[in-house]
Interface confidence: medium
Amino acid sequence: GKGDPKKPRGKMSSYAFFVQTCREEHKKKHPDASVNFSEFSKKCSERWKTMSAKEKGKFEDMAKADKARYEREMKTYIPPKGETKKKFKDPNAPKRPPSAFFLFCSEYRPKIKGEHPGLSIGDVAKKLGEMWNNTAADDKQPYEKKAAKLKEKYEKDIAAYRAKGKPDAAKKGVVKAEKSKKKKEEEEDEEDEEDEEEEEDEEDEEEEEDDDDE
């Protein structure tokens, strides 16, 4: 089954409320447009990053209210017998594909560790995040293309796995995504991505950005 239908709906974060609002706004403005979800998520997170604490406040209030609702409902909720056990995760199920950022990290993490052996895991992650944000979109393309191909493969694999409906069905069919030709990094100056510095033009129905947004 799909879990207990009586179980209270999970609590939403302030960011989740913000994304929900974005989607509703977009639906109103472009009722017929099909949404490119990776692009949508990217734009949402960029907009969220540039918002002031005051602007985020209303979403934080919504999250607080929702948390209170969740806690209130959970007090009276009695889970059905045997539902407390963690859901079985099939080790043979196709693995979720890595994101473009993850692929970028895999390539650059050893370089950072080599150059700065004393850095903590957190600092390495922070540095990787900064490097990614300062890589222009044209130079993100190799990682994005590779991630898109792996995602496509994963979707086929997971569909086949579900169609077979047996936990070990994936054993034969799921081949580790073959390592696609590693991008020979050209040693280039890393530049800010134009859309990092996005300002919102409220009058403007269209939110315009620099050419590196794709």
Epitope: C22, E39, D139, E191, E214
Partner: antibody
């Protein structure tokens, strides 16, 4: 509606100079990298120059064929982009287009990009 | 870095035509396709290999495999007669690249 309108084309002699302009409207110009693309009569499209935004220090890039002779610049307060062409050669004869590629709409990519109608530059003695 | 396109292609009205674009960087870079009508107006018809811009007919589709990107036009109409250019970015410190263009003739 988005508009890019080029002006300033004309007939000049080899080794002379000419400055063409592009007036942009209908989008947040200061957030847009701008390009000049040209097309010689009967030939294909060729990227000529690119200028990035203020956060990127208005970095400029040029095709090898025009390096050292052409200068791209912009005035964000006027939503204008310019191409100063010095020491012109007969092979610079072309239709010059101003373009703002790879735009986005709202929060979802529309993939649309904007082109001007072009301005003709003829270099002939 | 070059993008190679066939100089011309022809198709009978209502049929399907494919135009190819080859370049060593295409496994790692996105291909974009432009249509230039006889009046010289330029419109992008495909971006990021296979995405269609808003306002472009769903008769236009794009794909990319290895070093080749392909633009396909199904149910070709007379108004599709135009020059088609592929373009790809190279790396951020260089200008993008255009293919030489393919002149599409619609017969019948």
């Amino acid at each position: 509606a988005v508009q890019l309108v080029e002006s300033g084309g004309g007939l000049v002699q080899p080794k002379e100079s000419l400055k063409i302009s592009c007036a942009a409207s209908g989008f947040t110009f200061s957030n847009a990298a701008m390009y000049w693309v040209r097309q010689a009569p009967g030939k294909g499209l060729e990227w000529v120059a690119r200028i990035r935004t203020k956060p990127n220090n208005y970095a400029t890039y040029y095709a090898d064929s025009v390096k050292g002779r052409f200068t791209i610049s912009r005035d964000d307060s006027k939503s204008m982009v310019y191409l100063q062409m010095d020491n012109l050669k007969t092979e610079d004869t072309a239709m010059y287009y101003c373009t703002a590629p790879r735009r986005t709409e709202g929060i979802v990519s529309s993939g649309v990009d904007y082109w001007g109608q072009g301005v003709m530059v003829t270099v002939s003695s | 870095y070059e993008l190679i396109q066939p100089p011309s292609a022809s198709v009978t009205l209502g049929n399907t035509v494919s135009i190819t674009c080859s370049g060593d960087e295409l496994p790692k870079r996105y291909a974009y396709w432009y249509q230039q009508k006889p009046d010289k107006s330029i419109v992008r018809v495909i971006y990021k290999d296979s995405e269609r811009p808003s306002g472009i007919s769903d008769r236009f589709s794009g794909s990319s495999s290895g070093t080749t990107a392909t633009l396909t036009i199904r149910g070709t109409q007379a108004e599709d007669e135009a020059d088609y250019y592929c373009h790809s970015t190279y790396s951020d410190d260089k200008l993008p690249v255009f293919g030489g263009g393919t002149k599409l003739t619609v017969l019948g």
